[in-house]
């Protein structure tokens, strides 16, 4: 197996790799640096493995995961001591290293000059006390969501920056607003931005308005 | 109910070869793998190789390496075991046993009722 | 391949009895560990999975455990149906191996 590559978007975490199998079979193992190597995926002819179930155990822990390639039937292809080839992956530490799932603008309510735009709080894969946690949950106030927002008539665009997941924004009365937003975590060297969110317009379902 | 009902008892010459069936009833043949597991009078178990019904990809333990073949027909759900070379330590009572889904944990949750191989000349 | 050794080879206990058998492995296996029972002309049966998850249908007198690649099984009162031989198996590496057998009887 070669191209090891880890894919995660809020946790979901597949590790996937190449090439496609004739005659071989694949088992997965994973491990943090001080832990087991537990098998996942055994003797599968696929080239992806979900590992989720692993990594949510303790998502600040740095992860590594081997692939080994097993011979179908008759093929002969073992190591010189019989033992079964394998290849490492990449090292993987969740916190640090999963994208972040493009966030949605889950409502918005104006009151005079004033907009309150509310971000949904994500559900991850990640448990506690067996409840699944939000991405807040996970990331308290290392995420930070950044609102991108404009007059329906105009293309200047303002920004936001929260620690939660709400905003108060200003705006001029009598004119129709356009939102995105964006989540954040500044601390990180990669993967610090999600892709933005849809975008939403005041006069939408999502919104309420009030003197 | 789930059962695996394997081939009646077989007696061979060292040299020869031997074949043993497992019919599978009561699930979805494709969603399990089949495991061949092996035991000798009075000794203990043997884990043969593994065989995919789904894409009839197999996997054999290396002390079997070109020796053994594991067969499958997905029309009578039906998987084979082929044991060649046949010898005198090959005696032994032979099991087809189902193991996990490929997300699933390798145990084996059922077992055929064993098939008495003997190899005497 | 990964050696599961068990121990002890036999015992004798008497009904009612806390009967204690244990594997242990080479390497670390994880939790990747299952425990069969076998009588005698009969196929194994699955007890543990996991090391220590009890399979559908097995009474809770037995039980499964882990401390490093040390595993532990336990019948907590021993009962006359109990008398069998019990293996457990690894599934962490290629091979799958079982350990040697603990041939359980009644004093």
């Known amino acids: 197996a070669f191209n090891l590559t880890w894919i995660s978007t809020d946790f979901k975490t597949i590790l996937e790799w190449q090439p496609k199998p004739t005659n071989y079979t694949y088992t997965v193992q994973i491990s943090t640096k001080s832990g087991d190597w537990k098998s996942k995926c055994f003797y599968t002819t696929d080239t992806e493995c979900d590992l989720t179930d692993e990594i949510v155990k303790d998502v600040k822990q740095t992860y590594l995961a081997r692939v080994f390639s097993y011979p179908a039937g008759n093929v002969e292809s073992t190591g010189s001591a019989g033992e079964p080839l394998y290849e490492n992956s990449p090292e993987f530490t969740p916190y640090l290293e999963t994208n972040l799932g493009q966030p949605t603008i889950q409502s918005f309510e104006q009151v005079g000059t004033k907009v309150n735009v509310t971000v949904e709080d994500e559900r991850t894969l990640v448990r506690r006390n067996n409840t699944f946690l939000s991405l807040r949950d996970v990331f308290g106030k290392d995420l930070i969501y950044t609102l991108y927002y404009w007059k329906s008539s105009s293309s200047g665009k303002k920004t936001a920056k929260t620690n939660t997941n709400e905003f108060l924004i200003d705006v001029d009365k009598g004119e129709n607003y356009c939102f995105s937003v964006q989540a954040v975590i500044p601390s990180r060297t990669v993967n610090r931005k999600s892709t933005d969110s849809p975008v939403e317009c005041m006069g939408q379902e999502k919104g309420e308005f009030r003197e | 109910q789930v059962q695996l009902v394997q081939s009646g008892a077989e007696v061979k010459k060292p040299g020869a070869s031997v074949k043993v069936s497992c019919k599978a009833s009561?699930?979805?043949?494709?969603?399990?793998?089949m495991h061949w597991v092996r035991q000798a009078p009075g000794q203990g178990l043997e884990w043969m190789g593994i065989i995919n019904p789904s894409g009839g990809i197999t996997v054999y333990a290396q002390k079997f390496q070109g020796r053994v073949t594991m067969t499958r027909d997905t029309s009578t759900s039906t998987v084979y075991m082929e044991l060649s070379s046949l010898r005198s330590e090959d005696t032994a009572v032979y099991y087809c046993?189902?193991?996990?889904?490929?997300?699933?944990?390798?145990?084996?949750?059922?077992w055929g009722q064993g098939t008495m191989v003997t190899v005497s000349s | 391949d990964i050696q599961m050794t068990q121990s002890p080879s036999s015992l004798s206990a008497s009904v009612g009895d806390r009967v204690t058998i244990t594997c242990q492995a080479s390497q670390d296996i994880s939790n990747s560990l299952n425990w069969y029972q076998q009588k005698p002309g009969k196929a194994p049966k699955l007890l543990i999975y996991?090391?220590?998850n009890l399979e559908t249908g097995v009474p809770s007198r037995f039980s499964g455990s882990r401390s490093g690649t040390d595993f532990t099984f336990t019948i907590s009162s021993l009962q006359p149906e109990d008398i069998a031989t019990y293996y457990c198996?690894?599934?962490?590496?290629?091979?799958?191996?079982f350990g040697g057998g603990t041939k359980v009887e009644i004093k």
């Open positions: 996991d090391a220590s």
């Open positions: 198996q690894q599934y962490n590496f290629h091979p799958l191996t």
């Open positions: 009561g699930y979805t043949f494709a969603n399990y793998y």
């Open positions: 046993a189902r193991g996990g889904s490929k997300v699933a944990a390798l145990a084996f949750d059922i």
